[in-house]
């Protein structure tokens, strides 16, 4: 069973560092949860090194990760969502170094998808909609989203909204006239889970109206 | 001050069903697992299960799986433990403890409900 | 599943008097916590994760143990630690060890 490394025990396996970090995504495939852990170094050897996680599942004591080229990952049914878990990684019976993680602390949300952008001419706007496959999920529900979006020539200079919905409205004054933009989306848990940023959705591309001479507004694409 | 409030003592038929109740107070009840615990002769202390008040979840020492059930009514800060068909090896104090989840030791405990199966 | 045996089962001692009781595990465990329980009462959280004391618990209280084998320690018997002490494993099916009645002389 896992436990805390004691001083002395390790011999040479102590004198690297071990340190890691793991994400969870819950209901990521129907009802079974993941959770993901990676070494933070690299150049870590990881041959012979295992994962394990004990505490806070249901009917097991324990559960061992499967290795996937340099990461480690699990697909249970078995996780409580509640307290914190002790994550170990191990030679053997030996653990090398644990931590103690509360997995709705780690929730990493699936990125977005269906990202579209449709302009209305009478509004003088653009209608930003994308989906998430957490409307449908029992637990990790309420998302905060982050909608990025740049112009193309500008690579570094995004502007970022922040929203609990999965439309947004631009105004079409705040854009530059035809223009070429990019625009993408990300989420993060907002209640009760806790967690990171998901990836970004796949980005979208859309072209903003010439300005029309005499009225001073954009022409429609 | 944290509270775990049990219903009274029970004396049941053999066969029949009977549910206890634990009512929570002074914390996030949603915050803790709710465990249920069985002593016997005024000794032994057997673990019989938990629930995630959040979620519902539950996990059950397989010793107890049929014989108990355990639920939780998050309105009222309430978790149940039903147990079914009774036999006097059930005859028994029935305890709810709350679970530290940071530790995984049992560090509120209600006063215990005595359940007697008699005919 | 693990199995935590206590030992010994009953024991008995002078106020003052250094205590020791062991609870011995089946296979190796991380975490070790203990309870007291005095008659007609509930257990009390006590000892958690090894060492650390709960709330409320007296000084003279000490834990330790790795690996099969855990301790709780009273320094100086006093009267109000007589009382029956059982350890815990941490992890499921969270299992009890049988209890040690301690008594005063």
């Known amino acids: 069973e896992s436990g805390y490394a004691q001083n002395g025990d390790l011999e040479d396996a102590e004198l690297d560092d071990y340190s890691f970090s793991c994400y969870s995504q819950l209901e990521v495939n129907g009802s079974q949860h993941s959770l993901t852990c990676a070494f933070e170094d690299p150049d870590v050897n990881t041959t012979n090194l295992e994962f394990e996680i004990c505490g806070a599942l249901v009917e097991v004591k324990c559960l061992n990760f499967r290795k996937l080229q340099e990461i480690y990952f699990i697909e249970t049914k078995k996780f409580l969502l509640i307290g914190k878990s002790n994550i170990c990684v191990k030679v053997g019976e030996k653990s090398l170094t644990c931590k103690k993680i509360d997995l709705t602390t780690i929730v990493k949300p699936e990125a977005p998808f269906d990202l579209s952008v449709i302009y209305r001419e009478g509004a003088n706007d653009f209608v930003v909609t994308f989906n998430t496959s957490h409307l449908q999920k029992k637990y990790v529900k309420v998302l905060m989203h982050d909608v990025a979006y740049r112009q193309e020539k500008d690579e570094n200079k995004w502007t970022h909204v922040n929203l609990s919905s999965t439309k947004l409205t631009l105004l079409q004054r705040k854009l530059q006239p035809a223009a070429m933009y990019e625009i993408k989306v990300r989420s993060i848990p907002d209640h009760y889970f806790k967690g990171f940023w998901s990836e970004w959705s796949p980005s979208y591309y859309f072209r903003t109206p010439e300005i029309n001479n005499s009225s001073g507004e954009m022409d429609p694409i | 001050e944290v509270q775990l409030q049990q219903s009274g003592p029970e004396l049941v038929k053999p066969g029949a069903s009977m549910k206890i109740s634990c009512k929570a107070s002074g914390y996030s009840f949603t915050g803790y697992t709710m465990n249920w615990v069985k002593q016997s002769h005024g000794k032994n202390l057997e673990w019989i299960g938990l629930?995630?008040?959040?979620?519902?979840?539950?996990s059950y020492n397989q010793n107890f799986k049929g014989k108990a059930t355990l639920t939780v009514d998050k309105s009222s800060s309430t978790a149940y433990m039903e147990l079914l068909n009774l036999t006097s090896e059930d005859s028994a104090v029935y305890y709810c403890?709350?679970?530290?989840?940071?530790?995984?030791?049992?560090?509120?405990w209600g006063a215990g409900t005595t359940v007697t199966v008699s005919s | 599943e693990i199995i935590l045996t206590q030992s010994p089962a009953i024991t008995a001692a002078s106020l003052g008097q250094k205590v020791t009781i062991t609870c011995s595990a089946s296979?190796?465990?991380?975490?070790m916590h203990w309870y007291q329980q005095k008659s007609g009462t509930s257990p009390k959280p006590w000892i958690y994760e090894i060492s650390k004391l709960a709330s409320g618990v007296p000084a003279r209280f000490s834990g330790s143990g790795s690996g099969t084998s855990y301790s709780l320690t009273i320094s100086s018997m006093e009267a109000e630690d007589a009382a029956i002490y059982y350890c815990q494993y941490w992890n499921y099916p969270y299992t009890f060890g049988g209890g040690t009645k301690l008594e005063i002389k």
């Open positions: 403890a709350r679970g530290d989840g940071n530790y995984w030791y049992f560090d509120v």
């Open positions: 629930i995630n008040p959040y979620s519902g979840i539950t």
């Open positions: 296979s190796s465990v991380s975490y």
